[in-house]
Amino acid sequence: MAVTACQGLGFVVSLIGIAGIIAATCMDQWSTQDLYNNPVTAVFNYQGLWRSCVRESSGFTECRGYFTLLGLPAMLQAVRALMIVGIVLGAIGLLVSIFALKCIRIGSMEDSAKANMTLTSGIMFIVSGLCAIAGVSVFANMLVTNFWMSTANMYTGMGGMVQTVQTRYTFGAALFVGWVAGGLTLIGGVMMCIACRGLAPEETNYKAVSYHASGHSVAYKPGGFKASTGFGSNTKNKKIYDGGARTEDEVQSYPSKHDYV
């Protein structure tokens, strides 16, 4: 039950996170005109990854896309790439995790396959979240660097325009949305990975019985082995003291090398 809850919660948190990453990527307010201690203008400038906008005091807003690809700064291109990679990985992760959900039955899919898929989606969410956080952080660093630079006739770093008036840019809402969304996706991914550890396959219908061969301390199991998932627990027989048969239900589990990805 706890595993299902952890998996479900991880999925929901990741879903919200990826929706946030998509929203942040599409938002125009990655950087906004700094209004503090600046010449007060009757227009408000703000910029996104794809276009820059100007809002006049009347409320009239005009946005212009960055129609050049080669003319854009490498850093902006890198941020775009990171955000898109984050979205793609997140979307694939969501698709995979839907099929991996314990509460959803698809044909005769084994728990081992679900565990595999849960881990895969978890890793995808983690990478997706890291991509978003990295993208937003790179952009924020770019803003901080430009903020302190002399801005008279300076290259704004956005859309290849020359700055003719001292306009400084500060963090826009999209940066905060991106950081939070990236963090949520990361947390969701971690939860999926944790859930994967608890997704042990269902027991076989018959009991595996241990037999003592005379003069040997080795227990022999005729069939009925658990299929190794690569993600679940390794099975190791308990030492048998009473010479009687023990069921696999009593077998202790030990962490495998796959548990710590």
Epitope: A42, V43, C53, V54, S58, V162, V165, T167
Partner: antibody, heavy 120, light 113 residues
């Protein structure tokens, strides 16, 4: 059509206050900035400030801070400017104007002006 | 405050003549975000309130005759009247529409011979 009708001429004593009105019609009053401009006899134009009736936000030219107070009555779509502690150099024609939408903050409609004479 | 300087202060021309009015600002009125200049031209005829002629330095207000043309960028702007008519007798003001407080030039009085 858009119209801005200003109140009649005022003759006031030095040190007194006066309130000028600007009744608007033909557009949504709360969606546009109202500006006030001063023009002394035979001289140029001086921007006093602007007021947004939708939110009650006002911006003033520092030279008129404490001199002019901009307000509005949304129910009657009327903007007001109160001038206090009047002196002789406050004698001028005062215009109310509307800031256009998508016109680079330009003032596209003007009232006919109100003449204020400060004299003892 | 931004200082707007207009020249000449007055100008006498004959009808049909081409006339150029100049306006200079102490700071650039070009906004990098949309590459637009926030400069406006007004025409004020005697005893009347000013009328909007040109905004964004070069966009004609609807109803304004096409003989009026605005040009320039940054700090230097011009208003050109391609063929002056008798009804163009007025004072022309340029205005900074970018920085607060908005400021007007001293005006150029256009007179007809």
């Amino acid at each position: 059509q858009v119209q801005l009708k200003q109140s009649g001429a005022e003759l006031v004593r030095p040190g007194a206050s006066v309130s000028l009105s600007c009744k608007t019609s033909g557009y949504i009053f709360t969606s546009y900035w109202i500006h006030w401009v001063k023009q002394r006899s035979g001289q140029g134009l001086e921007w006093i400030g602007r007021f947004y009736p939708g939110t009650g936000t006002a911006y003033y030219n520092e030279n008129f801070e404490g001199k002019a107070t901009l307000t509005a009555d949304r129910s009657s779509s009327t903007a007001y400017m109160q001038l206090s502690s009047l002196k002789s150099d406050d004698s001028a024609v005062y215009f109310c104007t509307r800031e256009g939408y998508g016109k680079g903050n330009a003032m596209d409609y003007w009232g006919q002006g109100t003449s204020v004479t400060v004299s003892s | 405050d931004i200082v707007m300087t207009q020249s000449p202060s007055s100008l006498t021309v004959t009808t049909g003549e081409k006339v150029t009015l100049s306006c200079k600002s102490s700071q650039s009125l070009l906004n990098a975000g949309n590459q637009k200049n926030y400069l406006t031209w007004y025409q004020q005829k005697s005893g009347q309130p000013p009328e909007l002629l040109i905004y964004w330095a070069s966009t004609r207000e609807s109803g304004v005759p096409d003989r009026f043309t605005g040009s320039g960028s940054g700090t230097d702007f011009t208003l050109t009247v391609s063929s002056v008519q008798a009804e163009d007798l007025a004072v022309y003001y340029c205005q900074n529409d970018y920085y607060f407080p908005f400021t007007f030039g001293g005006g150029t009085k256009l007179e007809i011979k």
